[in-house]
Interface confidence: low
Amino acid sequence: LNTTILTPNGNEDTTADFFLTTMPTDSLSVSTLPLPEVQCFVFNVEYMNCTWNSSSEPQPTNLTLHYWYKNSDNDKVQKCSHYLFSEEITSGCQLQKKEIHLYQTFVVQLQDPREPRRQATQMLKLQNLVIPWAPENLTLHKLSESQLELNWNNRFLNHCLEHLVQYRTDWDHSWTEQSVDYRHKFSLPSVDGQKRYTFRVRSRFNPLCGSAQHWSEWSHPIHWGSNTSKENPFLFALEA
């Protein structure tokens, strides 16, 4: 069974330390080739995927992953017990919730089993690599004739998340966005009853419990108001 793991691009905060460990050799050999960088993301603190680009190897190689937590009770070296594969070659490791300790320094080591001197070790701060699930259950309430309130839920501790709300009418070229703190509600004070509004929200593990840079996926959109699309000159541009 081949598993393709899609992870967000970029990983700004992951490499607190990154170093390649090699033994000196007389001539250029496989042990001097750098190993691919490991990128880890903690999904809703339910599981973590640590992945690498297996195609960067000069020949197909089943790299192995070990991990431990620095200066903690969990400093025993652990072998990956659940590898992810790309075209039958190891390309990642999945760790389950019980193996995730957010606030201890996570050390991950990639190794070429055919050339044990060829290894790379990275130290990661997992609290900066959390990606929550997308917000759910968006609801709109009319507070007054012209004021709307948007509420939503997250499958996560509310106080750990900040949010970004985007909204637009069918007449708008672009989204208007507004940051929202952990209270997860948003008010739009002035609503035009003749327009149809679309709202969506995404969330991030920041700043009260970590400093993650990556946002969740966008929620499913929610709509409000009359559908005036027939007279809307921008409709085709929006749907193109």
Epitope: N44, V45, E46, S72, K97, H101, L102, Y103, Q104, Q127, R155, F156, L157, C160, C209
Partner: nanobody
Framework: QVQLVESGGGLVQAGGSLTLSCAAS????????VGWFRQAPGKEREFVAS????????YYDDSVKGRFTISRNNAWNTVNLQMNNLKVEDTAVYYC???????????WGQGTQVTVSS
């Protein structure tokens, strides 16, 4: 089932100190995170501070940063909230909460009243 019991609330003058305690029914917390929240009359419940099992994931709301300190004992069966330089606006019922994972606080205490007078 984890039962949480708060203690240490009371009446104090502005500028004074109190220490709230949250105990997990005489045994260790089986949870990943413990937090303190508060609710003032007519207001929503708001986050105050939280601490992770390892003790190094500690976070505060901006309104209490530098004045309040959350800590846990090594046995992980008591979590304290040391509150210094109390202000009238800190008056509220303070609740302790604990979560098995990171999706929700599954367990809540009954709350302890903190009143700060001017």
């Amino acid at each position: 089932q984890v039962q949480l019991v708060e203690s240490g609330g009371g009446l104090v003058q502005a500028g004074g100190s109190l220490t709230l305690s949250c105990a997990a029914s005489g045994r260790t917390f089986s949870t990943d995170v413990v937090g303190w929240f508060r609710q003032a009359p007519g207001k929503e419940r708001e986050f105050v501070a939280s601490i992770s099992r390892s003790g190094d994931g500690i976070y505060y709301d901006d309104s209490v940063k530098g004045r309040f300190t959350i800590s846990r004992n090594n046995a992980w069966n008591t979590v304290n909230l040391q509150m210094n330089n109390l202000k009238v606006e800190d008056t509220a019922v303070y609740y302790c909460a604990a979560g098995d994972g990171w999706s929700t606080y599954d367990y809540w205490g009954q709350g302890t009243q903190v009143t700060v007078s001017s």
